[in-house]
Protein backbone atom coordinates (compact mmCIF):
# COMPACT_ATOMS: atom_id res chain seq x y z
CA UNK A 1 0.00 0.00 0.00
CA UNK A 2 1.07 3.44 -0.90
CA UNK A 3 0.56 6.43 1.00
CA UNK A 4 -0.76 9.55 -1.53
CA UNK A 5 0.80 12.32 0.15
CA UNK A 6 4.36 10.16 0.25
CA UNK A 7 4.09 9.19 -3.05
CA UNK A 8 2.38 11.50 -5.11
CA UNK A 9 5.19 12.13 -7.45
CA UNK A 10 6.19 8.34 -8.06
CA UNK A 11 5.42 7.16 -11.17
CA UNK A 12 4.17 3.30 -9.60
CA UNK A 13 2.43 5.03 -7.19
CA UNK A 14 -0.49 7.47 -9.13
CA UNK A 15 -1.43 9.62 -6.12
CA UNK A 16 -4.65 9.69 -4.16
CA UNK A 17 -5.66 12.46 -2.15
CA UNK A 18 -4.08 13.16 1.38
CA UNK A 19 -4.31 10.34 3.83
CA UNK A 20 -5.25 8.09 1.22
CA UNK A 21 -3.61 4.81 0.75
CA UNK A 22 -3.36 3.35 -2.64
CA UNK A 23 -3.57 -0.18 -3.53
CA UNK A 24 -3.80 -1.47 -7.09
CA UNK A 25 -6.40 0.79 -9.20
CA UNK A 26 -8.03 1.77 -5.37
CA UNK A 27 -7.67 4.59 -3.20
CA UNK A 28 -8.14 3.49 0.77
CA UNK A 29 -9.33 5.79 3.62
CA UNK A 30 -8.72 4.44 7.32
CA UNK A 31 -10.13 6.14 9.48
CA UNK A 32 -8.74 7.22 12.93
CA UNK A 33 -12.10 8.60 14.34
CA UNK A 34 -14.97 6.03 15.27
CA UNK A 35 -18.68 6.35 13.85
CA UNK A 36 -21.59 4.29 13.48
CA UNK A 37 -21.85 2.47 10.40
CA UNK A 38 -24.21 4.81 8.71
CA UNK A 39 -22.54 7.98 9.84
CA UNK A 40 -19.53 5.71 7.97
CA UNK A 41 -21.02 5.60 5.26
CA UNK A 42 -22.40 8.92 4.81
CA UNK A 43 -18.58 9.81 5.45
CA UNK A 44 -17.58 7.81 2.50
CA UNK A 45 -19.91 8.80 -0.05
CA UNK A 46 -19.31 12.36 0.64
CA UNK A 47 -15.72 11.66 -0.45
CA UNK A 48 -16.89 10.05 -3.57
CA UNK A 49 -16.60 6.50 -2.28
CA UNK A 50 -18.10 3.63 -0.67
CA UNK A 51 -17.84 2.05 2.33
CA UNK A 52 -15.02 -0.73 1.84
CA UNK A 53 -16.49 -3.67 -0.55
CA UNK A 54 -13.99 -6.42 -0.68
CA UNK A 55 -14.32 -7.65 -4.29
CA UNK A 56 -11.83 -11.32 -3.59
CA UNK A 57 -9.86 -13.00 -0.63
CA UNK A 58 -6.58 -11.41 -2.32
CA UNK A 59 -7.97 -7.82 -1.23
CA UNK A 60 -9.21 -9.05 2.06
CA UNK A 61 -5.73 -10.43 3.46
CA UNK A 62 -3.68 -7.94 2.01
CA UNK A 63 -6.43 -5.11 3.95
CA UNK A 64 -6.47 -7.05 7.18
CA UNK A 65 -2.09 -7.08 6.90
CA UNK A 66 -2.77 -3.44 6.89
CA UNK A 67 -5.05 -3.06 10.35
CA UNK A 68 -4.83 -3.87 13.60
CA UNK A 69 -7.25 -5.78 16.07
CA UNK A 70 -9.25 -2.63 16.01
CA UNK A 71 -12.88 -3.30 13.94
CA UNK A 72 -13.23 -0.92 11.16
CA UNK A 73 -16.96 -0.90 9.43
CA UNK A 74 -17.40 -1.89 6.07
CA UNK A 75 -20.04 -1.81 3.65
CA UNK A 76 -21.41 -4.95 4.95
CA UNK A 77 -25.18 -5.63 6.23
CA UNK A 78 -27.57 -9.04 6.44
CA UNK A 79 -30.12 -8.15 4.80
CA UNK A 80 -32.05 -11.66 4.47
CA UNK A 81 -28.45 -12.66 3.43
CA UNK A 82 -25.29 -11.15 3.96
CA UNK A 83 -24.03 -8.52 1.20
CA UNK A 84 -22.22 -5.46 0.04
CA UNK A 85 -23.82 -1.89 -0.54
CA UNK A 86 -23.85 -2.50 -4.42
CA UNK A 87 -25.93 -5.78 -3.97
CA UNK A 88 -23.71 -8.40 -4.05
CA UNK A 89 -23.57 -11.47 -1.64
CA UNK A 90 -20.67 -11.79 0.55
CA UNK A 91 -19.33 -15.31 -0.99
CA UNK A 92 -15.44 -15.61 -0.40
CA UNK A 93 -15.29 -15.37 3.15
CA UNK A 94 -17.54 -16.28 6.62
CA UNK A 95 -18.62 -13.56 8.55
CA UNK A 96 -18.67 -14.53 12.68
CA UNK A 97 -22.06 -13.32 13.43
CA UNK A 98 -23.73 -14.46 16.59
CA UNK A 99 -27.37 -12.45 16.63
CA UNK A 100 -29.61 -11.65 14.53
CA UNK A 101 -29.36 -8.34 16.06
CA UNK A 102 -26.16 -7.52 14.78
CA UNK A 103 -26.48 -6.74 10.97
CA UNK A 104 -23.84 -4.51 9.95
CA UNK A 105 -20.12 -5.76 9.31
CA UNK A 106 -17.06 -5.03 10.08
CA UNK A 107 -13.29 -6.13 9.78
CA UNK A 108 -10.50 -6.50 11.45
CA UNK A 109 -6.94 -8.53 11.04
CA UNK A 110 -8.40 -11.51 11.77
CA UNK A 111 -11.88 -12.34 10.79
CA UNK A 112 -15.20 -9.84 9.28
CA UNK A 113 -17.30 -10.10 12.62
CA UNK A 114 -20.96 -8.77 12.46
CA UNK A 115 -21.89 -6.22 15.12
CA UNK A 116 -24.72 -4.00 15.70
CA UNK A 117 -25.09 -0.81 13.55
CA UNK A 118 -24.68 1.67 16.30
CA UNK A 119 -21.95 0.76 17.57
CA UNK A 120 -18.85 3.44 17.13
CA UNK A 121 -16.60 2.15 14.82
CA UNK A 122 -13.25 3.21 13.13
CA UNK A 123 -14.05 2.49 9.24
CA UNK A 124 -12.68 2.11 5.61
CA UNK A 125 -13.32 3.84 2.34
CA UNK A 126 -12.46 3.11 -1.38
CA UNK A 127 -12.96 4.55 -4.46
CA UNK A 128 -11.30 4.22 -7.80
CA UNK A 129 -7.88 5.93 -7.78
CA UNK A 130 -7.69 8.76 -10.37
CA UNK B 1 -26.75 -23.31 18.87
CA UNK B 2 -26.79 -20.76 22.36
CA UNK B 3 -27.43 -22.13 25.29
CA UNK B 4 -26.82 -20.55 29.23
CA UNK B 5 -27.10 -22.44 32.09
CA UNK B 6 -27.04 -21.49 35.98
CA UNK B 7 -26.01 -23.16 38.77
CA UNK B 8 -26.47 -21.89 42.65
CA UNK B 9 -26.95 -23.44 45.81
CA UNK B 10 -30.65 -23.45 46.20
CA UNK B 11 -30.89 -22.59 49.93
CA UNK B 12 -28.55 -19.66 51.26
CA UNK B 13 -28.66 -18.30 55.26
CA UNK B 14 -29.34 -14.80 55.69
CA UNK B 15 -25.82 -12.49 55.99
CA UNK B 16 -23.76 -15.49 53.55
CA UNK B 17 -22.74 -14.87 50.39
CA UNK B 18 -24.02 -16.26 47.12
CA UNK B 19 -21.94 -17.52 44.53
CA UNK B 20 -23.75 -18.12 41.18
CA UNK B 21 -22.32 -19.76 38.18
CA UNK B 22 -23.56 -19.02 34.61
CA UNK B 23 -22.38 -22.15 32.10
CA UNK B 24 -22.84 -21.19 28.34
CA UNK B 25 -21.85 -22.53 25.01
CA UNK B 26 -22.74 -21.24 21.48
CA UNK B 27 -20.61 -18.36 21.00
CA UNK B 28 -17.64 -17.19 22.63
CA UNK B 29 -17.64 -14.62 25.74
CA UNK B 30 -14.16 -13.19 24.05
CA UNK B 31 -15.65 -11.97 20.85
CA UNK B 32 -16.08 -8.30 19.91
CA UNK B 33 -19.93 -6.75 21.44
CA UNK B 34 -20.52 -9.95 23.35
CA UNK B 35 -21.77 -9.79 26.85
CA UNK B 36 -23.28 -11.85 29.72
CA UNK B 37 -25.82 -10.39 32.53
CA UNK B 38 -27.89 -11.23 35.63
CA UNK B 39 -31.56 -10.49 36.01
CA UNK B 40 -33.67 -11.99 38.89
CA UNK B 41 -37.13 -12.10 39.27
CA UNK B 42 -38.90 -12.21 43.33
CA UNK B 43 -41.63 -14.86 43.15
CA UNK B 44 -44.26 -13.57 41.60
CA UNK B 45 -42.40 -10.02 40.78
CA UNK B 46 -41.52 -8.31 38.27
CA UNK B 47 -38.04 -8.72 36.42
CA UNK B 48 -34.43 -7.10 37.84
CA UNK B 49 -31.86 -6.72 36.35
CA UNK B 50 -28.55 -7.15 38.52
CA UNK B 51 -25.33 -6.64 36.38
CA UNK B 52 -23.61 -7.69 33.59
CA UNK B 53 -20.06 -8.24 31.90
CA UNK B 54 -18.82 -7.87 28.71
CA UNK B 55 -16.37 -9.03 26.19
CA UNK B 56 -13.13 -7.07 27.41
CA UNK B 57 -14.57 -7.28 31.16
CA UNK B 58 -16.16 -4.12 31.69
CA UNK B 59 -18.39 -4.73 34.21
CA UNK B 60 -21.27 -2.61 35.25
CA UNK B 61 -23.85 -3.41 38.43
CA UNK B 62 -26.98 -2.10 39.69
CA UNK B 63 -26.32 0.98 41.84
CA UNK B 64 -28.56 -0.14 44.96
CA UNK B 65 -27.04 -3.54 44.79
CA UNK B 66 -23.19 -2.02 43.86
CA UNK B 67 -21.72 -2.77 47.22
CA UNK B 68 -23.00 -5.95 47.11
CA UNK B 69 -22.42 -7.52 43.76
CA UNK B 70 -19.05 -8.74 41.71
CA UNK B 71 -19.32 -10.26 38.72
CA UNK B 72 -16.34 -11.99 37.14
CA UNK B 73 -15.73 -14.20 33.70
CA UNK B 74 -13.70 -17.01 32.43
CA UNK B 75 -13.41 -17.38 28.74
CA UNK B 76 -11.94 -20.15 28.79
CA UNK B 77 -14.00 -22.14 30.45
CA UNK B 78 -17.39 -20.67 29.09
CA UNK B 79 -18.21 -19.27 32.62
CA UNK B 80 -19.77 -16.47 33.86
CA UNK B 81 -19.31 -15.72 37.91
CA UNK B 82 -22.02 -13.80 40.22
CA UNK B 83 -21.18 -13.44 43.63
CA UNK B 84 -23.45 -11.40 46.10
CA UNK B 85 -22.72 -11.02 49.78
CA UNK B 86 -25.10 -10.43 52.76
CA UNK B 87 -27.59 -12.08 51.96
CA UNK B 88 -31.05 -11.28 52.79
CA UNK B 89 -34.74 -13.21 52.36
CA UNK B 90 -35.46 -10.35 50.41
CA UNK B 91 -33.01 -11.66 48.24
CA UNK B 92 -35.21 -15.28 47.52
CA UNK B 93 -35.89 -14.97 43.95
CA UNK B 94 -35.30 -16.82 40.57
CA UNK B 95 -31.65 -15.84 39.42
CA UNK B 96 -31.29 -15.79 35.27
CA UNK B 97 -28.29 -15.43 33.35
CA UNK B 98 -28.36 -14.09 29.87
CA UNK B 99 -26.46 -13.05 26.69
CA UNK B 100 -26.18 -9.83 26.03
CA UNK B 101 -25.94 -7.63 22.51
CA UNK B 102 -23.19 -4.57 22.43
CA UNK B 103 -25.53 -1.55 21.01
CA UNK B 104 -22.69 0.91 21.43
CA UNK B 105 -22.96 2.15 25.20
CA UNK B 106 -21.45 -0.45 27.63
CA UNK B 107 -24.31 0.62 30.72
CA UNK B 108 -27.51 0.02 28.77
CA UNK B 109 -29.04 -0.81 25.53
CA UNK B 110 -28.43 -4.51 24.98
CA UNK B 111 -30.66 -7.11 23.90
CA UNK B 112 -30.91 -9.88 25.68
CA UNK B 113 -31.30 -12.41 23.14
CA UNK B 114 -31.09 -15.70 24.80
CA UNK B 115 -31.64 -16.93 28.64
CA UNK B 116 -30.97 -19.44 30.78
CA UNK B 117 -33.77 -21.71 32.98
CA UNK B 118 -32.85 -19.69 35.87
CA UNK B 119 -31.91 -21.12 39.60
CA UNK B 120 -33.88 -20.46 42.46
CA UNK B 121 -32.65 -19.36 45.74
CA UNK B 122 -33.90 -19.45 49.23
CA UNK B 123 -33.32 -17.10 51.69
CA UNK B 124 -34.04 -18.18 55.05
CA UNK B 125 -32.22 -19.07 58.21
CA UNK C 1 -35.27 5.07 37.03
CA UNK C 2 -37.53 5.06 34.42
CA UNK C 3 -40.48 3.15 35.46
CA UNK C 4 -42.17 1.09 32.88
CA UNK C 5 -46.05 1.23 32.90
CA UNK C 6 -48.08 -1.71 31.39
CA UNK C 7 -51.41 -2.62 31.01
CA UNK C 8 -53.76 -4.05 31.24
CA UNK C 9 -51.93 -6.29 33.63
CA UNK C 10 -54.05 -9.25 33.27
CA UNK C 11 -55.79 -10.02 29.48
CA UNK C 12 -57.97 -12.95 28.97
CA UNK C 13 -58.43 -13.32 25.11
CA UNK C 14 -60.06 -16.03 22.80
CA UNK C 15 -58.22 -18.21 20.47
CA UNK C 16 -58.07 -16.40 17.44
CA UNK C 17 -58.71 -12.99 18.65
CA UNK C 18 -56.32 -10.57 18.45
CA UNK C 19 -54.62 -8.57 21.45
CA UNK C 20 -52.85 -5.84 22.86
CA UNK C 21 -51.06 -4.97 25.41
CA UNK C 22 -49.78 -1.13 25.94
CA UNK C 23 -46.38 0.31 27.36
CA UNK C 24 -45.71 3.39 28.65
CA UNK C 25 -42.36 5.13 29.95
CA UNK C 26 -42.56 7.39 32.26
CA UNK C 27 -39.87 9.41 30.61
CA UNK C 28 -38.88 9.51 26.76
CA UNK C 29 -36.97 6.62 26.05
CA UNK C 30 -35.38 7.84 22.37
CA UNK C 31 -31.86 7.42 22.99
CA UNK C 32 -29.55 10.23 22.34
CA UNK C 33 -28.13 8.39 18.82
CA UNK C 34 -31.67 8.61 17.88
CA UNK C 35 -32.62 4.69 18.74
CA UNK C 36 -35.07 3.62 20.72
CA UNK C 37 -34.29 0.31 23.12
CA UNK C 38 -37.41 -0.76 24.07
CA UNK C 39 -38.00 -4.51 23.83
CA UNK C 40 -40.96 -6.83 24.58
CA UNK C 41 -39.99 -10.56 26.02
CA UNK C 42 -42.28 -12.91 26.76
CA UNK C 43 -42.26 -15.32 29.64
CA UNK C 44 -44.48 -19.09 29.66
CA UNK C 45 -45.32 -21.05 32.16
CA UNK C 46 -42.87 -22.36 34.09
CA UNK C 47 -39.95 -20.81 31.78
CA UNK C 48 -37.49 -18.14 31.54
CA UNK C 49 -38.34 -15.12 29.47
CA UNK C 50 -37.30 -15.03 25.54
CA UNK C 51 -36.57 -11.91 23.52
CA UNK C 52 -39.62 -11.16 21.00
CA UNK C 53 -38.99 -7.93 20.03
CA UNK C 54 -36.14 -5.72 19.71
CA UNK C 55 -35.86 -1.59 19.29
CA UNK C 56 -39.47 -1.24 18.92
CA UNK C 57 -40.84 -3.10 15.94
CA UNK C 58 -38.07 -5.63 14.78
CA UNK C 59 -38.86 -9.25 15.47
CA UNK C 60 -36.69 -11.55 16.59
CA UNK C 61 -35.23 -15.15 15.10
CA UNK C 62 -38.08 -17.34 15.13
CA UNK C 63 -40.73 -15.14 16.46
CA UNK C 64 -44.04 -15.39 14.48
CA UNK C 65 -45.14 -12.55 12.32
CA UNK C 66 -48.49 -12.24 14.18
CA UNK C 67 -46.10 -10.09 16.86
CA UNK C 68 -45.72 -6.75 15.75
CA UNK C 69 -44.59 -3.90 18.29
CA UNK C 70 -44.98 -0.07 17.44
CA UNK C 71 -44.83 3.14 19.11
CA UNK C 72 -42.17 5.93 19.96
CA UNK C 73 -41.16 8.49 22.53
CA UNK C 74 -42.92 7.28 25.44
CA UNK C 75 -45.86 4.86 24.45
CA UNK C 76 -45.71 1.66 22.80
CA UNK C 77 -47.24 -1.25 21.71
CA UNK C 78 -47.51 -5.24 21.31
CA UNK C 79 -50.03 -6.34 19.21
CA UNK C 80 -50.58 -10.22 18.27
CA UNK C 81 -52.80 -10.38 15.28
CA UNK C 82 -54.38 -13.54 16.46
CA UNK C 83 -54.34 -15.41 19.61
CA UNK C 84 -52.93 -18.96 19.64
CA UNK C 85 -52.28 -21.38 22.53
CA UNK C 86 -48.65 -20.93 22.65
CA UNK C 87 -49.11 -17.39 23.31
CA UNK C 88 -50.12 -17.61 27.02
CA UNK C 89 -47.68 -16.35 29.44
CA UNK C 90 -46.57 -12.78 31.08
CA UNK C 91 -45.22 -9.92 28.28
CA UNK C 92 -42.76 -7.63 29.65
CA UNK C 93 -41.55 -4.19 28.15
CA UNK C 94 -38.27 -3.52 28.60
CA UNK C 95 -35.99 0.03 27.96
CA UNK C 96 -32.68 -0.41 27.65
CA UNK C 97 -32.30 3.52 26.69
CA UNK C 98 -31.37 4.82 30.03
CA UNK C 99 -29.54 3.93 33.41
CA UNK C 100 -30.42 1.40 34.80
CA UNK C 101 -32.22 -0.65 32.50
CA UNK C 102 -35.96 -1.56 33.65
CA UNK C 103 -39.08 -3.71 32.66
CA UNK C 104 -42.18 -3.25 33.31
CA UNK C 105 -44.17 -4.98 35.64
CA UNK C 106 -45.53 -7.86 33.47
CA UNK C 107 -48.89 -8.60 31.60
CA UNK C 108 -50.08 -11.97 32.04
CA UNK C 109 -52.06 -13.08 28.44
CA UNK C 110 -54.66 -15.82 28.66
CA UNK C 111 -57.08 -17.54 27.34
CA UNK C 112 -60.90 -17.22 27.56
Known amino acids: LCQGSKYSTCASCPSCPDHWMKYGNHCYYFSVEKKDWISSLEFCLARDSHLLMITDKQEMSLLQDFLSEAFHWVGLRNNSGWRWEDGSPLNFSRIYSNSLVQTCGAINKNSLQASSCEVSLQWVCKKVSP | QVTLKESGPGLVKPTQTLTLTCTFS??????????VGWIRQPPGKALEWLAH???????WYELALKSRLTISKDSSKNQVVLTMTNMDPVDTATYYC?????????????????WGPGTTVTVSS | DILMTQSPLSLPVTPGEPASISCKSS???????????LEWYLQKPGQSPRLLIY???NRFSGVPDRFSGSGSGTDFTLKISRVEAEDVGVYYC?????????FGAGTKLELK
Open chain 3, 55 to 57: KVS
Open chain 3, 27 to 37: QSIVHSNGHTY
Open chain 3, 94 to 102: FQGSHVPVT
Open chain 2, 53 to 59: IWWDDDK
Open chain 2, 98 to 114: ARVIYYGSRSAYYSMDY
Open chain 2, 26 to 35: GFSLSTFGMG
